[in-house]
């Protein structure tokens, strides 16, 4: 059998291999050692017994999409049946005090490969023997601790394969410089050690994408916006646009990146080298946001100009793949730069919202029969922008972290947007009050620290007699800018 017979459904073409040469990978036309690495078709009954205690699942992930020329990394993680794990020596053991269908196991090992390899004979002194080889016959690399690696992973894509010895998790990186753009398929087959041979335990496949467009994501956030994911924002408040470029292999690390914004509101083009930008829409409506990201990245050089025509001379017949018999252009010089572009487009809706909320007065409410611990305080609140439909107050400790009480209630406010919110405080002390006004699309917050004094009957009585004038002088109630600082920190990534 050949590798493509084992690893794929269909034999890939030489055309595919020639057009996608992966550095360090081998042609899947190579022979597969079926004696050492048996091949089982899907549905073969032997799969049922390929692992003690159930089936092993292989999970294949990648950091796709990959910008052509960058590295893409594939990770395979083995998920063992319940109560099983790999120990420091690479053996598979039962987790302590873990109960599965078979109950608690007396034998701590599922597979004790260490014992087997110490027991093993037939070695030639170098630690190399006829069974410490990959499916194509290449010997295992002797990294430190290689004997504790008991799984063989065979990766297969684009008519080529890559073999790796590993533990329950492996990663493989591939440079995409020679990979055809578009979606591609990676398939992985995993074998485990079994005496002097190997047994297949899992197969997995995943699609990855190679692109010549910079993968771009934009997060949009705005103070007072109720739901940042619905692409509806508020008029007259800055929106923060933060651009994230998906570049896990840091291919663009040394590139100058330009961001060209069109906000769709006739404010023209805005070009920046900063990945974060603020923009304020001053009109309601629907706007088309467009971003173009440009980066000068390492890329292929244009081919040299063709030589002047010359009389045709006999040319050698087609050599093996990779000998470039058909006038394949020169391999790109690594120093060439090419402009890469990424695009992002969104339609955003701008609506009225509550722009600002302020507590302009705090007043102690005199009670004819004062409670022993309870104080009522009125907060006089103003707002700008749209009219709120609900008010929430959160009363917490002076650090504004430990909530003691939270109340929300609907409100009916006139167009002047002036309302009084009454809240009860249990006992004297300093409190943090978060007061939020909300409507369908916005949520505006303000915070105040207030000090509630001790209540003695005399002072209460005296205040009552004074007719309630100037009572807020009793309180040391300074509005603080805590909410501004907090909000800024939250939204700038």
């Amino acid at each position: 059998k050949r590798f493509h017979d084992v690893l794929g459904n269909e034999r890939p073409s030489a055309y595919m291999r020639e057009h996608n040469q992966l550095n360090g990978w081998s042609s899947d036309e190579n022979d597969w050692n079926e004696k050492l690495y048996p091949v089982w078709k899907r549905g073969d009954m032997r799969w049922k017994n390929s692992w003690k205690g159930g089936r092993v699942q292989a999970v294949l992930t990648s950091d796709s999409p990959a910008l052509v020329g960058s590295n893409i990394t594939f990770v395979v993680n083995l998920v063992f049946p319940r109560c099983q794990k790999e120990d420091a020596n690479g053996n598979i053991v039962y987790e302590k005090n873990c109960r599965n269908e078979a109950g608690l196991s007396a034998d701590p090992y599922v597979y004790n490969w260490t014992a087997w390899s110490e027991d093993s004979d037939g070695e030639n002194g170098t630690g190399q023997s006829h069974h410490n080889v990959f499916p194509d016959g290449k010997p295992f690399p002797h990294h430190p601790g290689w004997r504790r690696w008991n799984f063989v992973y065979v990766f297969h894509t684009l008519g080529q394969y890559f073999q790796k010895l590993g533990r329950c998790s492996v990663r493989v990186s591939v440079n995409t410089a020679n990979v055809t753009l578009g979606p591609q398929l990676m398939e992985v087959t995993v074998y485990r050690r079994h005496g002097r041979a190997y047994v297949p335990i899992a197969q997995v496949k995943d699609v990855y994408v190679v692109t010549d467009q910079i993968p771009v994501f934009v997060t949009m956030s705005q103070k007072n916006d109720r739901n940042s994911s619905d692409e509806t924002f508020l008029k007259d408040l800055p929106i923060t646009f933060d651009v994230l470029i998906h570049d896990p292999s840091h291919f663009l690390n040394y590139s100058t990146i330009n961001y060209k914004w069109s906000f769709g509101d006739n404010t023209g083009l805005f070009v920046s080298i900063n990945h974060t930008v603020n923009h304020t829409y001053v009109l309601n409506g629907t706007f088309s946001l467009n971003l173009t990201v440009k980066a000068a990245a390492p890329g292929p050089c244009p081919p040299p100009p063709p030589p002047p025509p010359r009389p045709p001379k006999p040319t050698p017949s087609l050599g093996p793949a990779g000998d470039n018999p058909l006038g394949l252009s020169e391999i790109p010089d690594e120093n060439c730069q090419i402009n890469r572009y990424g695009h992002f487009q969104a339609t955003i809706t701008i609506v009225e919202g509550i722009l600002e909320v302020n507590i302009i007065q705090t007043t102690d409410v005199l009670m004819l029969v004062p409670g022993p611990d309870s104080s009522l305080i009125d907060f006089v609140v103003t707002c700008q922008g749209s009219i709120p439909t609900e008010v929430c107050t959160i009363i917490s400790d002076p650090t504004c972290e430990i909530t003691q009480n939270a109340v929300c209630s609907p409100v009916d406010v006139d167009e002047m947007c002036l309302l009084t919110v009454r809240r009860a405080f249990n006992g004297s002390g300093t409190y943090c009050v978060n007061l939020t006004l909300g409507d369908d699309t916005s949520l505006a917050l303000t915070s105040t620290l207030i000090s509630v004094p001790d209540r003695d009957p005399a002072s209460s009585l005296r205040m009552a007699n004074s007719g309630g004038g100037g009572l807020n002088d009793i309180f040391e109630a300074q509005k603080i800018e805590w909410h501004e600082h907090h909000h800024h920190h939250h939204h700038h990534h």
Epitope: E10, R11, S13, Y15, L158, L181, P300, G327, L328, S329
Partner: antibody, heavy 119, light 107 residues
Framework: QVQLVQSGAEVKKPGASVKVSCKAS????????MHWVRQAPGQGLEWMGE????????NYAQKFQGRVTMTVDKSTSTVYMELSSLRSEDTAVYYC????????????WGQGTLVTVSS | DIVMTQSPDSLAVSLGERATINCKTS??????LAWYQQKPGQPPKLLIY???YRYTGVPDRFSGSGSGTDFTLTISSLQAEDVAVYYC?????????FGGGTKVEIK
């Protein structure tokens, strides 16, 4: 939808050169190799070569090596095929055809350009 | 280079009857073989790729089979609009090659 639109018919004298264009639209131009196939009157199809619009790598059939040059203009999504030292047996309809990913079969073809070489 | 041999050169079949065209390659190209239909004054039209997969929009009377070096295009019930020249093409390796063509006519 995918479209490949070729330049018009040409009449050339022996020894001259001809440059045929193929303008692509309806897909990401740099993602697919473009091939050139020719067909002499009453004859079969003959593959001439291919070019990758992304990096301008080329593969030419041995028969045309040294006489054919394939180039790309990414700004206009156009591929060019230039054939030099023309002879009468180069009289043919020249087609551009787009391959599909990693597979060299052709679902999309240009309408063809007739090149006549005559003294 | 891979040599493609298509047979027969021409074929006359009654309407509604089966038409079979063969394509032989000088080396194993399996499954990288495509079939095209070409009518006068038009570019070729892809029918079958990778030996047996019918391309989008191609009527199911067209089918491909074969492996290794021997491949077949079958038109199960010939229609008037199927009169054309049919070509096989190996897409296994470059240089790509086409068969010489088979002209299908109505008997």
């Amino acid at each position: 939808q995918v479209q490949l639109v070729q330049s018009g018919a040409e009449v050339k004298k022996p020894g001259a050169s001809v440059k045929v264009s193929c303008k692509a639209s309806g897909y990401t131009f740099t993602s697919y190799w473009m091939h050139w196939v020719r067909q002499a009157p009453g004859q079969g199809l003959e593959w001439m070569g291919e070019i990758n619009p992304y990096d301008q790598r080329t593969n030419y059939a041995q028969k045309f090596q040294g006489r054919v040059t394939m180039t790309v203009d990414k700004s206009t999504s156009t591929v060019y095929m230039e054939l030099s030292s023309l002879r009468s047996e180069d009289t043919a309809v020249y087609y551009c055809a787009r391959s599909t990913g990693n597979y060299a079969w052709f679902a999309y073809w240009g309408q063809g350009t007739l090149v006549t070489v005559s003294s | 280079d891979i040599v493609m041999t298509q047979s027969p050169d021409s074929l006359a079949v009654s309407l509604g009857e089966r038409a079979t065209i063969n394509c032989k390659t000088s080396q194993d190209v399996s499954p990288s073989l495509a079939w095209y239909q070409q009518k006068p004054g038009q570019p070729p039209k892809l029918l079958i790729y990778s030996a047996r997969y019918r391309y989008t929009g191609v009527p199911d009377r067209f089918s491909g089979s074969g492996s290794g070096t021997d491949f077949t295009l079958t038109i199960s019930s010939l229609q008037a609009e199927d009169v054309a020249v049919y070509y096989c093409q190996q897409h296994y390796s470059i240089p790509l090659q086409f068969g010489g063509g088979t002209k299908v006519e109505i008997k």
